[in-house]
């Protein structure tokens, strides 16, 4: 007898009531920037402190009648979803509310900025345990709001925000578009994206994951024991803020990068019906629904990786797209994707002392995406080894020659406009897993990493007949770090990682003759860290 | 409102020498940029967040804000500093006419200026 949303985020082998401890999230403070709230509601009484911060615009309309219960509605509900006694995710979390939205649910970028600054100053004056900031609001893209979020995140604060309810690309909104913020879309009881009137949840590469956001039962400001059902990406974000509080309470030392990777790792995978999203956004939108980890104990032994898509390069001939990992993450591989198939590959390059993934558009191409595989690899020392185009017919190859370095990813980049249409495919010599092989007219880049106990292996899956998609997955206990296509298949649109599966996409088979070039091989590099596993066992 | 006018007169006198000097001329080759919300109905013209370069100290932020007020007053414009940011981003929030944007973008330490805009509960 628990609400569907709490059941959904609870690991299947636990009964939700038993699983969620009464003090879950008790070491964490969650800041809520929203409307005013009814702090004496039974769900949140004694656990939400209303700060004296208020920065809101005047309500619109001369005849607007301020009714306390309406003014408090949005914020009270969200506070209840995060930490409510009965319908909350993190029932032990304490909260602080800042009023940045007026009685009509409207605020300003400047008011939100001042609110974020207030939180930072509070943190400096009185440092507490882990902080989560919930931003259940959205406005148009704002450079300054994103910058403020970035600064706060770099000060060790976890920011969680609503993706937005505009049935649009979340990258067009702030703070949803800020890379440092955990951006949450909304799904319903059927794990479908939430429709809200003619609109619905936002989507796209700026969304980190989805969470329950339709018919969410929570505290109603109508009365001190009332409940009401509300829907939206705010409700979804509140679930993730609650999950984050639970995780941080169990592991207070988690960094933002570690927390984000765990949220992704423990999410339900591939349950959302992607047909709801516009076709061009499907590949960019994560098919992840947030869930609590199956245990409140750490999962530090796992090698966590996530896929980060760049913005679209645009169609100009020399256009490039860049995908970046978070400061605490390692770029272990780089791939590219183009819907037209016209691209000039990708390369890993240093930028500001950190590796980035850059994809190159080709003449006549509609643009490319760069896809970075970003991983948590403590004490890693990674470098890129490059081999220039070879003249030999056997193609270009590069391997990790340094002692103790293992291959985590392969990239190839070429200057010629349409590689491979008139050249025979290059066959990869067997038994040489620690090297990247590419077309003789391409430069090949190997990502080589040294980290304690890191081991990697190459896994391939080739299909002789042309297919729109070829996949290869890493087995249990191994994590996908690299994803690429074997050279010589000219109709390949690109390669990218989806969770632990490497996906190689090809042009529509109907337009490709079933020649020898129809063969498509997906190459996955799967890694694991014995060092992390041992460290975890020693702790236990 | 009248009190503010009085303040501006004082500021103009106090800052005339600083403003006319070259002590804090903007760095060469760096142009501050202006940003505004792409969604027109959400724009809030008349209020601007002036973001200063990363290492700018609070005292410099306050000085830059005062300088803007003084230069605006000389041109017959009323401005109001609503908030001075420090702790997260250096800068200030100012209520002023859009006519002053060009002037504001040329101030020392300015990285970019963003017009305020609305955010909404989701």
């Amino acid at each position: 007898s628990i609400p569907w949303n709490l059941e959904r985020i609870t690991p299947p082998r636990y009964r939700a009531d038993e699983y969620q401890p009464p003090d879950g999230g008790s070491l964490v403070e969650v800041y809520l920037l929203d409307t005013s709230i009814q702090s004496d509601h039974r769900e949140i009484e004694g656990r939400v402190m209303v700060t004296d911060f208020e920065n809101v615009p005047e309500e619109d309309g001369t005849r607007f009648h301020r009714q306390a219960s309406k003014c408090d509605s949005h914020g009270t509900h969200l506070a209840g979803v995060v930490s409510g006694r009965d319908a909350g995710v993190a029932k032990g979390a304490s909260m602080r509310s800042l009023r940045v939205l007026n009685c009509q649910g409207k605020g300003t970028v400047s008011g939100t900025l001042i609110g974020l600054e207030f939180i930072r100053k509070s943190q400096l004056v009185q440092p507490v345990g882990p902080l989560v900031v919930l931003l259940p609001l959205a406005g148009g893209y704002s450079r300054v709001l994103n910058a403020a979020c970035q600064r706060l995140a770099r000060a060790g604060v976890v920011l969680v925000t609503a993706a937005g309810n505009f049935r649009d690309d979340a990258c067009l909104y702030s703070p949803a578009s800020a890379p440092e913020v955990i951006t949450v879309g909304a799904t319903n009881a059927q794990d479908q994206p939430v429709t809200l009137g003619t609109l619905g949840t936002n989507f796209g590469r700026c969304v980190d994951l989805f969470a329950p956001g339709e018919d969410i039962i929570g505290a109603s400001s109508d009365c001190s024991t009332c409940f009401v059902s509300q829907s939206g990406t705010s409700q979804a974000a509140a679930h993730v803020a609650g999950i984050a509080a639970m995780m941080l309470s169990a592991e207070p030392e988690l960094t933002l990068a570690e927390l984000r990777q765990r949220l992704i790792h423990f999410s339900a995978k591939d349950v959302i019906n992607e047909a709801w999203f516009p076709e061009d956004q499907r590949v960019l939108t994560p098919n992840l629904v947030a869930a609590l980890p199956p245990s409140t104990h750490g999962a530090g032994w796992q090698l966590f990786c996530r896929t980060v898509w760049s913005a679209h390069s645009g169609p100009t001939r020399m256009a490039t797209a860049v995908a970046r990992c978070a400061p605490d993450e390692e770029l272990l591989s780089c791939s590219s994707f183009s819907r037209s198939g016209k691209r000039r590959g990708e390369r890993m390059e240093a930028q500001g002392g950190k590796l980035v993934c850059r994809a190159h558009n080709a003449f006549g191409g509609e643009g490319v995406y760069a896809i970075a595989r970003c991983c948590l690899l403590p004490q890693a020392n990674c470098s890129v080894h490059t081999a220039p185009p070879a003249e030999a017919s056997m193609g270009t190859r590069v391997h990790c020659h340094q002692q103790g370095h293992v291959l985590t990813g392969c990239s190839s980049h070429w200057e010629v406009e349409d590689l491979g249409t008139h050249k025979p495919p290059v066959l990869r010599p067997r038994g040489q897993p620690n090297q990247c092989v590419g077309h003789r007219e391409a430069s090949i880049h190997a990502s080589c990493c040294h980290a304690p106990g890191l081991e990697c292996k190459v896994k391939e899956h080739g299909i002789p007949a042309p297919q729109e998609q070829v996949t290869v997955a890493c087995e249990e206990g191994w994590t996908l770090t690299g994803c690429s296509a074997l050279p010589g298949t000219s109709h390949v649109l690109g390669a990218y990682a989806v969770d632990n599966t490497c996906v190689v996409r090809s042009r529509d088979v109907s337009t490709t003759g079933s020649t020898s070039e129809g063969a498509v091989t997906a190459v996955a590099i799967c890694c694991r860290s014995r060092h992390l596993a041992q460290a975890s066992q020693e702790l236990q | 409102q009248e009190d503010e006018d009085g303040d501006y007169e004082e500021l103009v006198l106090a800052l005339r020498s600083e403003e006319d000097g070259l002590a804090e001329a903007p760095e060469h080759g760096t142009t501050a940029t202006f940003h505004r919300c792409a969604k027109d109905p959400w724009r809030l013209p008349g209020t601007y967040v002036v973001v200063l370069k990363e290492e700018t100290h609070l005292s410099q932020s306050e000085r830059t804000a005062r300088r803007l007020q003084a230069q605006a007053a000389r041109r017959g414009y009323l401005t109001k500093i609503l908030h001075v940011f420090h702790g997260l981003l250096p800068g200030f929030l100012v209520k002023m006419s859009g006519d002053l944007l060009e002037l504001a973008l040329k101030l020392p330490h300015v990285d970019y200026i963003e017009e305020d805009s609305s955010v909404f509960a989701q």
Epitope: S1, I2, P3, D40, K91, I217, D222, C223, T225, F227 | -
Partner: antibody, heavy 126, light 106 residues
Amino acid sequence: QLQLQESGPGLVKPSETLSLTCTVSGGSIWSSSYYWTWIRQPPGKGLEWIGSINYRGSTYYNPSLKSRVTISVDTSKNQFSLKLSSVTAADTAVYYCARENSGVVPAAGPNWFDPWGQGTLVTVSS
Amino acid sequence: EIVLTQSPATLSLSPGERATLSCRASQSVSSYLAWYQQKPGQAPRLLIYDASNRATGIPARFSGSGSGTDFTLTISSLEPEDFAVYYCQQRRNWFTFGGGTKVEIK
């Protein structure tokens, strides 16, 4: 059919602590659908809500009594208890336990006090 | 705290007559008001909840109306078993009860 039964001493000395237990039968305390509540009625007077608890042990008290009240739950025994410290003659009353639908699961019924125990009279006297 | 004032304190009527009981709140309680019936030596029993909804098993002669600050409990035709004390209760803000109205046989 759910039934509630109050038990505890009928006489308590002033300044001591009043302790009562409510045993729930015909249903489980273990449910997020309900709060378990104490209400009292001084002789010939009206009703006063004392406080409520859910199966997780999360409490909610009448502000006027908060400093003296402790409500606890024992799900293994299907019981919840009331402790009222520093009692005076003004605390003499019939003490009732009742169930209240929390409102989290709307299908569980109206969000009011129903059913009630039959009540137990506690007299504070030396 | 929201104070509920019930009137009259006592209502003397004969069986078959119509009883009208009033409950006034010191501030709006919206429709978050219930009515209980208490007979001597018994616990209160829920009659009406959310101002106008009859609880399970309550006869149709009992009806509730009102919202905001003024509420009425009506017993259309008094039966012998209806002579009791009636309390109103709000849950808009915490829980408070009215002082009660005693319906006695005339």
